[in-house]
């Protein structure tokens, strides 16, 4: 019986060369989170946060992905190719999987200042 809901940072934008936080939050469930997977638009895994083993950042992203805050993920040195969908998948007992979606748009540095609610200065 899946009672929980995933809240995400939704659609966000950030400057090329900058950093951004991808954040998902699971609420309204008693379920226990055993693992959180972060995937990119092409379904490649960026990182896994495991309850026992901690964080694992996949080699292709090691230089540009930082774990946290919390179960979130920080993308650094953004390029235009980083534009696209990102997914968080919560593995929970006994509910099963919850999946959240974030759309990131990377803007050229020349573009006017944008909402920086989830951006790191």
């Amino acid at each position: 019986m899946m009672t929980g809901t995933i809240e995400t940072t939704g659609n966000i934008s950030a400057k090329k060369g900058g950093s951004v936080i991808l954040q998902c939050h699971l609420s309204s469930t008693m379920a226990q989170v055993t693992q959180v997977n972060w995937e990119q638009h092409d379904h490649s895994l960026l990182a896994i946060r495991n309850a026992e083993l901690g964080w694992h950042i996949y080699p292709a992203f090691k230089d540009r992905v930082a774990p946290g805050p919390g179960l979130g993920l920080t993308l650094q040195s953004l390029t235009m190719n980083d534009t696209g969908e990102y997914f968080c998948t919560y593995h929970t007992y006994p509910d099963g999987t919850y999946r959240g979606r974030i759309f990131l748009e990377v803007l050229e540095s020349s573009v006017a200042e944008h909402s920086a609610r989830f951006q790191i200065p």
Partner: antibody
Framework: EIQLVQSGSELKKPGASVKVSCKAS????????MNWVRQAPGQGLEWMGW????????TYAQGFTGRFVFSLDTSVSTAYLQISSLKAEDTAVYYC???????????????WGQGTMVTVSS | AIRLTQSPSFLSASVGDRVTITCRAS??????LAWYQQKPGKAPKLLIY???TLQSGVPSRFSGSGSGTEFTLTISSLQPEDFATYYC????????FGGGTKVEIK
């Protein structure tokens, strides 16, 4: 070695209470959900419910609400099952069992306690 | 709640026999099924999870298959230590167990 060690057998009178302990070792206690399973004499396995070892929140299966309480002491990596107002039909072996695996595809009860026999008799 | 029906309830077999136990779910559970072995006076032991993945340390004569509503546990060549009761369990929602299959010596 990963193991769950339960407290010893109990003989109780109807109406009394009992508290069964389940001590975990060899792994991070708060990383894995803990379940309780009942097996009446000569019967099959019955899932009683589980406790979130992160938050301490218990969830009880149908038929196990009211007189049954799951609790934790994370400082000593121990889960507890308390049964109050004992009845003859509570006579059974009670097991604690850890949910192993990290992704939902891997979930299963991979480590079990040895079981605690609770006998209720006047 | 999801109900699991195991068949047969009892099974008489000889050492060396190929044994198959079936578990049917009252609704689809994908591959979220585990199999356990229990010997008298002992705790259950995990044999197979995710319907077909062998738990570490379990002999390869044990195998599992199926998805959706129908699953099987197969012991390719029964050994003396395999005489026991076997249970299936679904983990698609709140866990439930099948009624068990007792494998006895013929």
């Amino acid at each position: 070695e990963i193991q769950l060690v339960q407290s010893g057998s109990e003989l109780k009178k109807p109406g009394a209470s009992v508290k069964v302990s389940c001590k975990a070792s060899g792994y991070t206690f708060t990383s894995y959900p803990m379940n309780w399973v009942r097996q009446a004499p000569g019967q099959g396995l019955e899932w009683m419910g589980w406790i979130n070892t992160n938050t301490g929140n218990p969830t009880y299966a149908q038929g196990f609400t009211g007189r049954f309480v799951f609790s934790l002491d994370t400082s000593v990596s121990t889960a507890y099952l308390q049964i109050s107002s004992l009845k003859a039909e509570d006579t059974a072996v009670y097991y604690c069992a850890r949910v192993g695996g990290y992704s939902v595809d891997e979930y299963a009860f991979d480590v079990w306690g040895q079981g605690t026999m609770v006998t209720v008799s006047s | 709640a999801i109900r699991l029906t195991q068949s047969p309830s009892f099974l008489s077999a000889s050492v060396g026999d190929r044994v198959t136990i079936t578990c049917r779910a009252s609704q689809g559970i994908s591959s979220y099924l585990a199999w356990y072995q229990q010997k008298p006076g002992k705790a259950p032991k995990l044999l197979i999870y995710a319907a077909s993945t062998l738990q570490s340390g379990v002999p390869s004569r044990f195998s599992g298959s199926g998805s959706g509503t129908e699953f099987t546990l197969t012991i390719s060549s029964l050994q003396p230590e395999d005489f026991a009761t076997y249970y299936c369990q679904q983990l698609n929602s709140y866990p439930t167990f099948g009624g068990g299959t007792k494998v006895e010596i013929k």
